[in-house]
């Protein structure tokens, strides 16, 4: 806390400039106007203080609005931003795409703080769900960003903002997370067609369910082994060779190599030995021949 | 034959909530997306969201978001749709409605419920 | 937000052709569907995906879709084709429906 003392003669600041960085701290509190400064909020940024100087700053934008700050003054925050705690961003009410992009920029380069996981929420939230505007721009500054959200919050987002996913934001995710965002693809992709669905839709396959694997595999689709092997093990097991053949076409000789690894490994010991025989890449473990198979599965449904 | 069966008229006061159920009979072992789409007396049809067959996903129309909950007991094959915040102006008969049609872009409504009434009055 | 506009009624004879048009910005590029309600029933879909018929729906209903423009045609229309007709389709983030044709068979 800076002590109350008074301006200096001749101190008095009249604007937000250069000379400001030789005023000690407790002369920045007694000559700066905080109304000058939250007028003049653009200017700072520009100015080389040190990080005491804008603790004091910061202090006296926080006399002047103990609510919180008001949008115009947040929009010029610039480095300012990083000296303000999760607590005083939740007093903020930010609508502007832009003032967002502004202080996303100022922590650009560095993991997502918790300041600026905050200032998204409260965008978000203010917002009413997650457009494909604001998520154009989390995505371009934090790609992990989607992923970092619960399945929950994933619900909030509609399917026209799925245009703006590009496949490296979905790295991070895992299958309840594509489980949300899957059948919101199938929503934002439906007026497709064919190859130009499946391009878009590849990304989001590890949420598919085995009925939407089937629909596909009579598409000529060509699924590499990449794809494949994110798909969810439980909806990969009820494909039959033939369905597996189909969805792969040419790939499907890059299942010997993955035979060992789930979902394939999986899904070999559920298949007759004879039917993967007739694939002809010598992957073994399937039911012998005489064998029979009791789908349990459906007599747990049936009772 | 597939029917969509979808429980009984309410009346409510404003302010309150409803929530309609919509169970499936027939070829349950399959799960839909299901549609809820609502008509007010004497007007057109108005969607309301939609949710995935598993039930984790829903997308609703901009118009009910945050006032309006889909959610789905796939051990009994019902949909359910609540309604907050009732007004009069949400008196309507509401609709469920599925997407049963073969093909990955299909999701016109081919199979519809008998229609709830919903009553808001004071 | 994104409208389907009809044309609020639609006369015919019995035995002669129906269209009912829907028009949207760019619905050419949706795929469109067409309900057909009768007073005090749940709708019936007629087309979906432009043109095509789910099964049991008679061959005299079909449809088209081009530029802004969908269609339904109803040939050699039938007394029990008397109705209200909505399109439908995806606008990005919601399916809409069109604002209704009653079809009057004269």
């Known amino acids: 806390e800076v002590e109350k003392t008074a301006c200096p003669s001749g101190k008095k600041a009249r604007e937000i400039d250069e000379s400001l960085i030789f005023y000690k701290k407790w002369e920045l509190e007694a000559c700066v106007d905080a109304a000058l400064l939250a007028t003049q909020m653009d200017r700072v940024n520009a100015i080389p203080f040190t990080y005491e100087q804008l603790d004091v700053l910061k202090h006296k934008l926080d006399e002047l609005y103990p609510q919180g700050y008001p949008e115009s003054v947040i929009q010029h925050l610039g480095y300012l931003f990083l000296k303000m705690s999760p607590e005083d961003i939740r007093k903020w009410n930010v609508t502007s795409l832009e003032t967002l992009k502004a202080l996303l920029e100022v922590n650009k380069g560095h993991e997502m703080s918790p300041q600026v996981a905050t200032l998204i929420d409260r965008f978000v939230k203010g917002r009413g769900q997650l457009d494909k505007d604001t998520l154009d721009t989390l995505t371009a500054f934090y790609p992990g960003y989607l992923c970092s959200l619960s399945p929950e919050e994933l619900s909030s987002v509609p399917p026209s903002s799925i245009w703006a996913v590009r496949p490296q934001d979905l790295d991070t995710c895992d299958p309840r997370q594509l489980d949300v965002l899957y059948p919101k693809a199938r929503l934002a992709f439906q007026n497709m067609n064919g190859s130009e669905y499946f391009v878009k839709i590849q990304s989001f396959l590890g949420g598919a369910p085995t009925e939407d694997l089937k629909a596909l595999s009579q598409q000529n689709v060509s699924m590499d082994l990449a794809t494949f092997m994110k798909l969810r093990t439980d909806a990969v097991l009820p494909l039959t060779v033939a369905e597996v053949q189909k969805l792969l076409g040419p790939h499907v000789e890059g299942l010997k190599a993955e035979e060992r690894h789930r979902p394939v490994r999986d899904w070999i010991l559920r298949q007759r030995q004879d039917d993967l025989d007739t694939l002809g890449l010598g992957l073994q473990g399937g039911i012998p021949n005489g064998y029979l198979v009791l789908d349990l599965s459906m007599q747990e449904a049936l009772s | 034959e597939v029917q969509l069966v979808q429980s009984g008229a309410e009346v409510k006061k404003p302010g309150a909530s409803v929530k309609v159920s919509c169970k499936a009979s027939g070829d349950t072992f399959k799960r839909y997306y299901a549609h809820w789409v609502r008509q007010a007396p004497g007007q057109g049809l108005e969607w309301m969201g939609i949710?995935?067959?598993?039930?984790?996903?829903?997308t609703y129309a901009q118009k009910f978001q945050g006032r309006v909950t889909m959610t789905r007991d796939t051990s009994t094959s019902t949909v359910y749709m609540e309604l907050s915040s009732l007004r009069s102006e949400d008196t309507a008969v509401y609709y469920c409605?599925?997407?049963?049609?073969?093909?990955?872009?299909?999701?016109?409504?081919?199979?519809w419920g008998q229609g709830t009434l919903v009553t808001v009055s004071s | 937000s994104y409208e389907l506009t009809q044309p609020p009624s639609v006369s015919v004879s019995p035995g002669q052709t129906a269209s009912i048009t829907c028009s949207g910005d760019?619905?050419?590029?949706?795929?469109g569907s067409w309900y057909q309600q009768k007073p005090g029933q749940s709708p019936v879909l007629v087309i979906y995906?432009?043109?095509r018929r789910p099964s049991g729906i008679p061959e005299r209903f079909s449809g088209s879709n081009s530029g802004n423009t969908a269609t339904l045609t109803i040939s050699g229309t039938q007394a029990m084709d008397e109705a209200d007709y909505y399109c439908q389709a995806w606008d990005g983030d919601a399916f809409v429906f069109g604002t209704g044709t009653k079809v009057t068979v004269l």
């Open positions: 760019m619905l050419g590029y949706q795929y």
């Open positions: 995906q432009d043109n």
């Open positions: 949710i995935n067959p598993s039930g984790v996903s829903t």
């Open positions: 409605a599925e997407s049963r049609l073969p093909g990955y872009n299909a999701f016109a409504m081919d199979v």
